[in-house]
């Protein structure tokens, strides 16, 4: 029987007795800034090169023994989950070992930094096909480590690393809080959380997903035919590299925006138990569990879409929060959240080139967050079109009035303090999807894009009754680009994608009298591209 | 993920550019910082990555590195360059007391300067 | 699925010996600290000895030292129970059982989280008696 | 060596009941203590380990809790499968001992 992480992560199709999905990652270099290894453990001779880089702290207290055994504990278990021949996920991926970390597992910023810097040189002299690199370690929030990272991955290669495994925000950890890397968290057979002694994965929005990381089953360094169950955020990130691998191997061209979104879209859904996280980091954690593509091809016609939680904006009255894209990827929409409900609202606006979403915190607030939907548009000419607070009593409306130009998301933004509260809902006139309406006293911005084959529409979800979430959801084929609440629901907190589905939150209802203002409308924006599709048919 | 609107703990020393015959004035009047991990038992003291702007040249490095050492002897500071950056990130890792911070925070072309810490294997 | 299969019980004599032999199947095996654990008629459960997964380390309960040994054949699946000197105390059933148990971990140390014995065999008698 | 105390050594239940069983270390063992279920004939079944944690296909009415010497076994409402004989277990570097059994009975 396979181990049950393999399971987990082994789409239906692939399964059988043997884990043996198609080409196990042949085309790629995996790279593991780790512990020393044992080259010669029967799960991994042949496929990983010890490299000569080896910068490593002295090993603390006078009463330590440096076992051999124990000095390749960690690095040898990992290995062997990326690229072990019974264990492994990805069984024709080659590795390079670099020792960063000691015999009991510590090393230091300035180790790791020259570790990546070793793997940049090496790549310009030897270029070869796509590179992973693996991080399972984390120090504290490190500037100078992110931006090694950000160079690296920048330079073409996709890093992966731990969200480390001390129960808390993974942005307070390096290399887990660079935005280049992808970060991992770790959950066990049950897709709970993995609890670590008293502590256990981190958390947060700084994660990117989440993979199998307790109980698993990988080379032990005691002797080359051991096995030994070892269980952290650094065997989750593992996983990831070796699916990393895969997807490389099977498409050699694919970014490092591409592979994220990717990752993201065949993880599994809203199975994680949520409650094990602290209430305050449930929403901004994802609830996903990654997984291998069920077939290796035949992705590219898709929409693809992620959402992307700034930093908390703090709570002074003019603070603000920005959430960003990365360099390849289009903002579609941008939306904001307050657990107070005190907010004034969110805009998109160029910074340095690029849109990036400001969400703005109102008086008396505790903070907002700002929410950009980040996506996968080839060849897109996006544009935002503002309209400013109308004189009259209709509301302010605004839409895409360049030719071709489709509504991918709307923002709304006031200067107000308090929206009025008393106004009635603004409703949308039918047969008008490609505008965005607001409150008069609010400025709208409508995210207006032209890329080959796109096309749009709006799908609404009302409750007369006061609800705290109003979900709308895009159909199969389509891709949640935009989300936002209808005007005059006055006590909503913020609206934010989960996934395909767009969440309006509201105050707890016990607080809102069940009056007209009650009612609450999610609306979604969904999209799909006719024009990926085709080339993906071409192509095959 | 973490961006420069970042919510993490650091501490910044922000220091001006005071006149120091041996120091140049970092350019525009940009301040140079100085970042530590917030995590006190992970802090490694005594050894520093100083990062230099972005566009600086290797030479450019090597010039800098050797310019902090001999303004560290003259005040009678030993300090070691443990390695000089290049192809990620421009700069240089030193072995020096904290008391020379201020004064390698002026040196030219200085990005930033980060306290060594602690990883740990997950 | 994991299963374990003990054998080698039977009677003897005090004074004699047996072994005890359980066979596994899976790699996870060789992945897991494993156990012996006796059930003595109509007694409670007592835990016997245990190895290491590389059988580098191996921990026995007092009244046994010096008897028993524990062993495990990782390219065989195997693990055994040599019993020497047996006593009509050690009457019992004999169960196998995998120690569930995985390392992570912390700041510069390397921890073992024990989940407890979660797979056993069906049991294997052991009567000692003239 | 470290001693498990368990009381009671029987209880008498019905079928609907909440019983708690307990467990008494003769010196601290933090958090490492498992509890399994055994039926006439058949090998023991893991149910909790690390004093509180439901070990995986183990119905959510048993659960356990307690640390450093005191420990419970609680069945919310005692199902006709539960009547079968409780032990717990503690871990101590690598070395275990087990408490000596309840009987949990049908009243």
């Known amino acids: 029987s396979i181990p049950w992480n393999l399971e987990r992560i082994t789409p239906p199709r692939y399964r059988a007795d043997e884990y043996q999905p198609p080409d196990g990652g042949s085309l790629v270099e995996v790279y593991l800034l780790d512990t020393s290894i044992q080259s010669d453990h029967r799960e991994i001779e042949g496929r990983v090169m010890v490299t000569d880089f080896e910068n490593v702290p002295e090993e603390d207290g006078t009463r330590f023994h440096r076992q051999a055994s124990k000095c390749d504990s960690h690095g040898t278990h990992l290995a062997g989950v990326v690229s072990g021949r019974d264990a492994g996920v990805a069984k024709g991926a080659s590795m390079r070992s670099l020792r960063v970390l000691n015999c009991q597992g510590k090393g230091t910023v300035s180790g790791t930094l020259i570790g990546l810097e070793f793997i940049r040189k090496s790549q310009l002299v030897q270029p070869v096909g796509p590179l992973v690199v693996l991080l399972p370690l984390a120090g504290g929030y490190s500037r100078v480590l992110n931006a090694a990272c950000q160079r690296l991955a920048r330079a073409g290669v996709v890093l992966v690393t731990a969200a480390g495994n001390f129960r808390d925000d993974a942005c307070l950890y390096s290399p887990a809080s660079a935005p280049e890397v992808i970060t991992v968290g770790a959950t066990n057979a049950q897709d709970q959380p993995v609890t670590l002694g008293t502590l256990g994965t981190n958390f947060g929005r700084c994660v990117d997903l989440f993979a199998p990381g307790e109980d698993i089953i990988g080379a032990s360094s005691d002797c080359s035919t051991c096995f030994v169950s070892q269980s952290g955020t650094s065997q989750a990130a593992a996983h990831v590299a070796g699916i990393a691998a895969m997807m490389l191997s099977a498409e050699p061209e694919l970014t490092l925006a591409e592979l994220r979104q990717r990752l993201i879209h065949f993880s599994a859904k809203d199975v994680i138990n949520e409650a094990w996280f602290p209430e305050d980091q449930r929403v901004l954690t994802p609830n996903l569990v990654a997984a291998l593509p069920p077939s290796t091809h035949g992705a590219g016609w898709q929409l693809f879409c992620r959402t992307v939680w700034s930093a908390h904006s703090g709570p002074t009255r003019m603070a603000t929060a920005v959430a960003r894209c990365a360099p390849d990827e289009e903002l579609l929409s941008c939306s904001s959240f307050s657990r107070s409900g005190k907010r004034r609202g969110e805009r998109m606006e160029a910074q340095g080139g690029k849109l990036v979403c400001r969400a703005h915190n109102a008086f008396g607030g505790e903070g907002v967050y700002a929410i950009a939907r980040c996506c996968l548009l080839p060849q897109a000419n996006c544009s935002v079109h503002t309209a400013p607070p109308a004189e009259a009593s209709m509301g302010t409306r605004v839409h895409c009035h360049q030719q071709g130009h489709v509504l991918t998301g709307c923002s709304s933004h006031w200067e107000v303090e308090d929206l009025g509260t008393h106004k009635p809902p603004v409703l949308r006139p039918r047969g008008q999807p490609n505008q965005c309406v607001g409150h008069r006293e609010a400025s709208i911005h409508a995210s207006c894009c032209h890329a080959p084959g796109l096309e749009c529409k709006v799908k609404e979800h009302g409750i007369p009754a006061p609800q705290e979430q109003v979900t709308v959801a895009c159909e199969e084929g389509w891709t949640l680009t935009g989300c936002s609440a209808l005007p005059g629901t006055s006590h909503v907190l913020g609206a934010y994608a989960v996934d395909n589905t767009c969440v309006v939150r509201s105050r707890d209802v016990s607080t809102t009298g069940s009056t007209s203002e009650g009612a609450v409308t999610a609306v979604a924006i969904c999209c799909r591209s006719r024009h990926l599709a085709q080339a993906s048919q071409e192509l095959q | 993920q973490e961006d420069e609107d970042g919510d993490y703990e650091e501490l910044v020393l922000a220091l001006r550019s005071e006149e120091d015959g041996l120091a140049e004035a970092p350019e525009h009047g940009t301040t140079a910082t100085f970042h530590r991990c917030a995590k006190d038992p992970w802090r490694l003291p005594g050894t520093y990555v100083v990062v230099l702007k972005e566009e600086t040249h290797l030479s450019q490095s090597e010039r800098t590195a050797r310019r902090l050492q001999a303004q560290a002897a003259r005040r009678g500071y030993l300090t070691k360059i443990l390695h000089v950056f290049h192809g990620l990130l421009p700069g240089f890792l030193v072995k020096m007391s904290g008391d020379l911070l201020e004064l390698a925070l002026k040196l030219p072309h200085v990005d930033y300067i980060e306290e060594d810490s602690s990883v740990f294997a997950q | 699925e994991v299963q374990l299969v003990e054998s080698g019980g039977g009677l003897v004599q005090p004074g004699g010996s047996l072994r005890l032999s359980c066979a596994a199947s899976?790699?996870?095996?060789?992945?897991?600290?494993m156990s012996w654990v006796r059930q003595a008629p109509g007694k409670g459960l007592e835990w016997v000895a245990n190895?290491?997964?590389?059988?580098?380390?191996?921990y026995y309960v007092d009244s046994v030292k010096g008897r028993f040994t524990i062993s495990r054949d990782i390219a065989k699946n195997s693990l055994y129970l040599q019993m020497n000197s047996l006593r009509a105390e050690d009457t019992a059933v004999y169960y196998c059982?995998?120690?569930?148990?995985?390392?992570?971990?912390?700041?510069?140390?390397?921890?073992?989280?024990?989940?407890?014995?979660?797979?056993w065999g069906q049991g294997t008698t052991v009567t000692v008696s003239s | 060596d470290i001693q498990m105390t368990q009381s009671p050594s029987t209880l008498s239940a019905s079928v609907g009941d909440r019983v708690t069983i307990t467990c008494r270390a003769s010196?601290?063992?933090?958090?490492?203590l498992a509890w399994y279920q055994q039926k006439p004939g058949k090998a023991p079944k893991l149910l909790i380990y690390?004093?509180?944690s439901l070990e995986s296909g183990v119905p959510s009415r048993f659960s356990g809790s307690g640390s450093g010497t005191e420990f419970t076994l609680t069945i919310s409402s005692l199902q006709p499968d539960d009547f079968a004989t409780y032990y717990c277990?503690?871990?101590?570097?690598?070395?275990?001992?087990f408490g000596q059994g309840t009987k949990l009975e049908i009243k």
């Open positions: 059982a995998r120690d569930r148990g995985t390392y992570y971990y912390t700041e510069g140390s390397y921890n073992y989280y024990y989940y407890g014995m979660d797979v």
């Open positions: 690390k004093a509180s």
């Open positions: 899976g790699i996870t095996f060789s992945s897991y600290w």
């Open positions: 010196q601290s063992i933090s958090s490492w």
């Open positions: 190895i290491k997964q590389d059988g580098s380390e191996k």
């Open positions: 277990q503690q871990y101590n570097s690598y070395s275990y001992t």
